[in-house]
């Protein structure tokens, strides 16, 4: 229904706390360089204004759209051009173009230092002194680094953060309590960030239809007992919610997400038998719980879908009458029977089926033509199954760090033009798939591996789009979203690449490496590995193993030496010389 004042409506629906959190996220995602203090001032002004509109919906400016109100706030910031350059040009535009302009200026790789977690004692002190401000800083820091983070989900992580601090700050060993718990929240949040970025990419590049297809497949897997009409309704609602969040309409997105959770809990009987536990929780946990819900049990007896989609002589007639509904039904029926497939695979199968019908229904004997489609599905199914098998075997053999290194070599050979930090980040994330997925039961491996890899590769594409350097990467990133992972997997060594000159300084290390945390040490070593491959793209596995083994020994030896600086200064050049020789 239409409301006189959109902002008053959202304030009342969401409540002050969530309203303020969402406004802070919105501002932090749009203006990523502004300090917390500046944003919190704007948040307070917007909140005060919303309260006046709640009191009187006819008050001045209360009828304006939220985009207009937020945009006006952002454009009123002094020195906007000094800090943001051409983003200030957006302010000359009218809505909705102004908001579109802001969206286009979101930076997926902002020049911000990595978020450093303070010492446990310091964290607890500032948390206990002012929990609201502490959690506000958390929202601000995450949102500005991840401008597409799913806002209502970020509120959930802030709540988790709050729970951990409340629990651990009363313990005697605060650090021992905080570190593993906060690491777990961070890991989940980082995965959530890349997954949501993938959804926004899908929405931006391929529109609502592509996202809705993704949602139909996912919902059908989770809720195999729900009717197609129910799945369609859920997918339509989820598409609207994600469109809003990806478009910066965070208040509407969060409000609609809460509505969807309410609907699902009121209609459990027609959706899934697994929802009750989620439905007993408060709103943020409820929505999150529903988003992560386990698959319902598949009906005991589901017939083959061949009768409706391959054997029926009327397939072309049914397809022509309502193409999207027919294909949607195919995707629904296939997906509810295959929770063991990735959504990407299910969408590739649906795409192949659509292409087959387009071709066959124009021919003289359509049934004979589309009757062979099942054989064409086989390679599509077997390719990702083999990918999972070979990669999980490699992970089990090498462990996470070794597996990351194997992927780093592979991807540096595929796209040596890509910057080393981007390659290292991508390989480290891709390598985590082993820990995340390979330990799962067989039926869960494929969806876990492929859908996670797709999200990580989307991040690589988003970063590469900003500064394109590799034709091969551009080619894989330009195609359909569901074909990306197979496209990257099929890439081989880039024969057009002219190897990088050997620069001794690239492989020169100092004693500061000794005091780095393990993760940073790994990144240093992986940076060296990528540079080695860029210098010698055709180096064999044994050559790289030798050089990296030497390097690890060298670091270990010098970090144990009495005079570390002297050791690095004298042993370093020897290492460089030996490495050059080993790779010659």
């Amino acid at each position: 229904e239409a409301h006189k004042s959109e902002i008053a409506h959202r304030f009342k629906d969401l409540g002050e706390q969530h309203f303020k959190g969402l406004v802070l996220i919105a501002f932090s995602q749009y203006l990523q360089k502004c300090p917390y203090e500046e944003h919190i001032k704007l948040v307070q002004e917007v909140t005060d204004f919303a309260k006046t509109c709640v009191a009187d919906e006819n008050a001045e400016n209360c009828d304006k759209s939220i985009h207009t109100l937020f945009g006006d706030k952002l454009c009123a910031i002094p020195k906007l051009r000094d800090n943001y350059g051409e983003l200030a040009d957006c302010c000359a535009k009218q809505e909705p173009e102004r908001n579109e302009c802001f969206l286009q200026h979101k930076d997926d790789n902002p020049n911000l230092p990595p978020f450093q977690r303070p010492e446990a004692e310091a964290m607890c002190t500032s948390f206990q002194e002012n929990p609201t401000s502490f959690l506000g800083h958390y929202l601000h820091e995450v949102a500005r680094r991840h401008p597409y983070f799913y806002a209502p989900e970020l509120l959930y992580y802030a709540e988790k953060y709050n729970e951990v601090l409340t629990q651990c700050c009363t313990e005697s060993d605060k650090a021992a309590c905080l570190t593993p718990k906060l690491d777990a929240v961070k890991e989940k949040a980082l995965v959530a960030a890349v997954r949501q970025r993938m959804k926004c990419s899908s929405m931006q590049r391929f529109g609502e239809r592509a996202f809705k297809a993704w949602a139909v497949a996912r919902m059908s897997q989770r809720f195999p007992n729900a009717e197609f009409a129910e799945i369609t309704k859920l997918a339509t609602d989820l598409t609207k919610i994600n469109k809003e969040c990806c478009h910066g309409d965070l208040l509407e997105c969060a409000d609609d997400r809460a509505e969807l959770a309410k609907y699902m809990c009121e209609n459990q009987a027609t959706i899934s038998s697994k929802l009750q536990a989620c439905c007993d929780k408060p709103v943020l946990q409820k929505s999150q719980c529903l988003a992560e819900i386990e698959h319902d049990n598949i009906p005991a007896d589901l017939p083959s879908i061949a009768a409706d989609f391959v054997e029926d002589k009327e397939v072309c007639k049914n397809y022509a009458e309502a193409k999207d509904v027919f294909l949607g039904t195919f995707l629904y029926e296939y997906s509810r029977r295959h929770p063991d497939y990735s959504v990407s695979l299910l969408l590739r199968l649906a795409k192949k089926y659509e292409a087959t019908l387009e071709k066959c229904c124009a021919e003289g004997d359509p049934p004979a033509c589309y009757g062979t489609v099942l054989a064409e599905f086989q390679p599509l199914v077997e390719e990702p199954k083999n990918l999972v098998k070979t990669n999980c075997e490699l992970y089990e053999k090498l462990g996470e760090y070794g597996f990351q290194n194997a992927i780093l070599v592979r991807y540096t050979q595929k796209a040596p033009q890509v910057s080393t930090p981007t390659l290292v980040e991508a390989a480290r994330n891709l390598g985590r798939v082993g820990t995340k997925c390979c330990t799962l039961p067989e039926a869960q491996r494929l969806p876990c591996v492929e859908d996670y890899l797709s999200a990580i590769l989307n991040r690589l594409c988003v970063l590469h789009e900003k500064t394109p350097v590799s034709e091969k990467v551009t080619k894989c990133c330009s195609g359909s979203l569901v074909e990306r992972r197979p496209c990257f997997s099929a890439l081989t060594v880039d024969e057009t690449y002219v190897p990088k000159e050997f620069k001794a300084e690239t492989f020169t290390f100092h004693s500061d490496i000794c005091t780095l945390p393990d993760k940073e040490k790994q990144i240093k070593k992986q940076t060296a590995l990528a540079e080695l491959v860029k210098h010698k793209p055709k180096a064999t596995e044994d050559q790289l193993k030798t050089v990296m083994g030497d390097f690890a020994q060298f670091v270990d030896k010098c970090c144990k030496a009495a005079d570390k600086d002297n050791c690095f200064a004298t042993e370093g050049p020897n290492l460089v010389a030996r490495s050059k020789e080993a790779l010659a």
Epitope: I298, A300, D301, L302, P303, S304, I305, A306, V310, E333, Y334, R337, H338, P339, D340, Y341, L374, F377, Q378, V381, E382, E442, A443
Partner: nanobody, 124 residues
Framework: EVQLVESGGGVVQPGGSLRLSCAAS????????MGWFRRAPGKEREFVAA????????YYADSVKGRFTISRDNSKKTAYLQMNSLRPEDTALYYC?????????????????WGQGTLVTVSS
């Protein structure tokens, strides 16, 4: 893990009958679609018949319809293939397969576990 062992194969005259059994161990079969496939000498493996988890749906290749019957007894963890009116062209190695998830029933790539096979020879 499911281990499947076929039995009941042998030599039979054209027009004769055989009953193949597929015994599962290691897990209950009630959560699996069960199927029979065969490979004739020098030919590709082909689908013969399949049955849904609780037996409500059965599927057959056109070449065996009306002659073969697939059934299952989940309590005995066994699937069966009753083969009547056998023909020389039915000569093949018959494999039993189990698939947790299946959309088509007839596609070998949807089956996760396979037996070693039992040989059926139809000859006069």
């Amino acid at each position: 893990e499911v281990q499947l062992v076929e039995s009941g194969g042998g030599v039979v005259q054209p027009g004769g009958s055989l009953r193949l059994s597929c015994a599962a161990s290691g897990s209950t079969i009630s959560s699996y679609v069960m199927g029979w496939f065969r490979r004739a000498p020098g030919k590709e493996r082909e689908f013969v018949a399949a049955i849904s988890r609780s037996g409500g749906y059965t599927y057959y290749a056109d070449s065996v319809k009306g002659r073969f019957t697939i059934s299952r007894d989940n309590s005995k963890k066994t699937a069966y293939l009753q083969m009547n009116s056998l023909r020389p062209e039915d000569t093949a190695l018959y494999y039993c397969a189990a698939g947790r998830y299946s959309a088509w029933y007839s596609q070998s790539y949807e089956y996760d576990y396979w037996g070693q096979g039992t040989l059926v020879t139809v000859s006069s």
